[in-house]
Amino acid sequence: VPDKTVRWCAVSEHEATKCQSFRDHMKSVIPSDGPSVACVKKASYLDCIRAIAANEADAVTLDAGLVYDAYLAPNNLKPVVAEFYGSKEDPQTFYYAVAVVKKDSGFQMNQLRGKKSCHTGLGRSAGWNIPIGLLYCDLPEPRKPLEKAVANFFSGSCAPCADGTDFPQLCQLCPGCGCSTLNQYFGYSGAFKCLKDGAGDVAFVKHSTIFENLANKADRDQYELLCLDNTRKPVDEYKDCHLAQVPSHTVVARSMGGKEDLIWELLNQAQEHFGKDKSKEFQLFSSPHGKDLLFKDSAHGFLKVPPRMDAKMYLGYEYVTAIRNLREGTCPEAPTDECKPVKWCALSHHERLKCDEWSVNSVGKIECVSAETTEDCIAKIMNGEADAMSLDGGFVYIAGKCGLVPVLAENYNKSDNCEDTPEAGYFAIAVVKKSASDLTWDNLKGKKSCHTAVGRTAGWNIPMGLLYNKINHCRFDEFFSEGCAPGSKKDSSLCKLCMGSGLNLCEPNNKEGYYGYTGAFRCLVEKGDVAFVKHQTVPQNTGGKNPDPWAKNLNEKDYELLCLDGTRKPVEEYANCHLARAPNHAVVTRKDKEACVHKILRQQQHLFGSNVTDCSGNFCLFRSETKDLLFRDDTVCLAKLHDRNTYEKYLGEEYVKAVGNLRKCSTSSLLEACTFRRP
């Protein structure tokens, strides 16, 4: 088999026939050096998954539940291409599983016990697996058989396809539990009708159901959605209030050596030639000999899944939690209101050491998880492997786009009620050596630049955003002659100045000596012409305040700030000579962990915060000898956010807009993956 062949897995005679037709028609339109199709027939989707894992086939299209199976070890498959529905201009690759209630009913998600429930059908995704999976640990024990536990949880239900003899309560609202449209409460529209008629109190359906059944907005306004954080929202706010976001139909491949680019090349060309309304001879999204053969008949085309996206991220935390609960059936001993330990994400072994000391001192309240980059940490928080970390504003933006929320802000000024007063922010500045007297904001081209890291506020987003407005392109590595911007591509001129050894060169963590505020300033001291840092960086590393050999003899007077008007000012005049105001660093977490992270961190800062006077003999949460490990070293306290509890509100409209403008220059693979899930 030539290397450019994609071996498609078919699960029936009809699929195999369509696959052969697909193969033959592709041969007729694709040049001989292009991708080709071969067909492999297996007895089931699970057999196809195993065949792909064993390198006997390359691709198959799966529903969400099977994407989960495909991801589990030893299969380790990943999503590579998604089918989309609707229009090319507004492609829908996901649907939202929601819980719909009547507006005046007054209960929340955590008060569903004893209510009457309407389901699309037993074992179906939005109508059963997701809601029951998420409610699993609230069900009365024994939880097996599941139908009995569900019957005992709700006071009555309609769950079409259930066994009405063994579980009569599941058929109480629709006698007989018929498994077809003969049952008026079957399927999406049926479950909604069950709610509408007043038979049930809650209907588990998908987000489009209510729009398909009620054309009139005034009628829709009689209904609300139950959110997982025990609030309610209007039905059109399903993107912010759902049980899970579920991919409709996805092509999977091996994680390693999975031919993902080739599969995309094949399917992209296939949709060009044989997509919706393209050809009479062969139609990719049509099944004359059956239904949904190889691809869904209702699909309109394909979209490439971003490479950073593994199955866990693609399926989303809520969906994975629900399905894992149902499959594994494990719950904490006795669900209590006690907070579980907060799993803090530490960057590389430098932060890990501090985190482990914190963990030991916290006596079980804090646990530590490591990752090599901030983006890897954010991904771990998204999928539940970690719970929280403190982030620069640029990463608060990415985390927010990935569904995380800010929970506490670092405060840098001493005040009486520090914890109650989140600050306006700090200043992003451009520092130069006083001796380089001809250097101004207007003649930085061709100079050597030092950045905290790509994607960070003071070191990247603010200066590069301002620069972008001037040069109108993203080739910052051509603007500066060389530099150190940790997180840049290794072969970029913006890694040339970095000092990390071997694989650590230009890494966005403390293994790279020029990483972070202190690192960027050190880069200026030793090699660079300009450093983009925060207004406190120079005073914190001069006058003997940083005892490291490179810093111990530095003098603040030897450095100056570049002002945007082309002038220069002394370092202490940052208030009148800065690039922009930056939002303070903030702790982020998943929505479901918000309350516990808030509670535990406030306890922890009372034990180990700024009130600890001797940091040589005691653990201090906000100290790490200018290394800014876990938190910035100048943190005085972690402050409540009050109503600034979303990333947009926290960062502010101006900053969100600035980072949004830089999006076209973004190299963030995580941001690309998260905007695929939520454009």
Epitope: H349, H350, L353, K354, D356, E357, V360, N361, S616, G617, N618, F619, S624, E625, K627, L629
Partner: nanobody, 114 residues
Framework: QVQLVESGGGLVQAGGSLRLSCAAS????????MAWYRQAPGEQRELVAA???????TYADSVKGRFTVSRDNAKDTIDLQMNSLKPEDTGVYYC????????WGQGTQVTVSS
Amino acid sequence: QVQLVESGGGLVQAGGSLRLSCAASRSISTLRFMAWYRQAPGEQRELVAAETSAGRLTYADSVKGRFTVSRDNAKDTIDLQMNSLKPEDTGVYYCAARGLADYWGQGTQVTVSS
């Protein structure tokens, strides 16, 4: 600055024992937190065992009951006694400490063959 130097690594059969030692270049009495980490190929460094200056001990779940950490302020060492070794204990073992600054050793290789 404190230099940390690990010794005692080597190749051992599953079920066997090794004692790793970490010697500091100066007094460890000012170090609040001393720990042993290990790193398997392609994995993150993970905490194996640690001791605080107040005598609080902690162990990774995977080594509880098999490994013992002991700190000797007089000799300026921290040792890790490893018994009932398993192939999954294989990796580079690093000594680390926190005081006025953070300190790491260069590591010593431990290989447990089955």
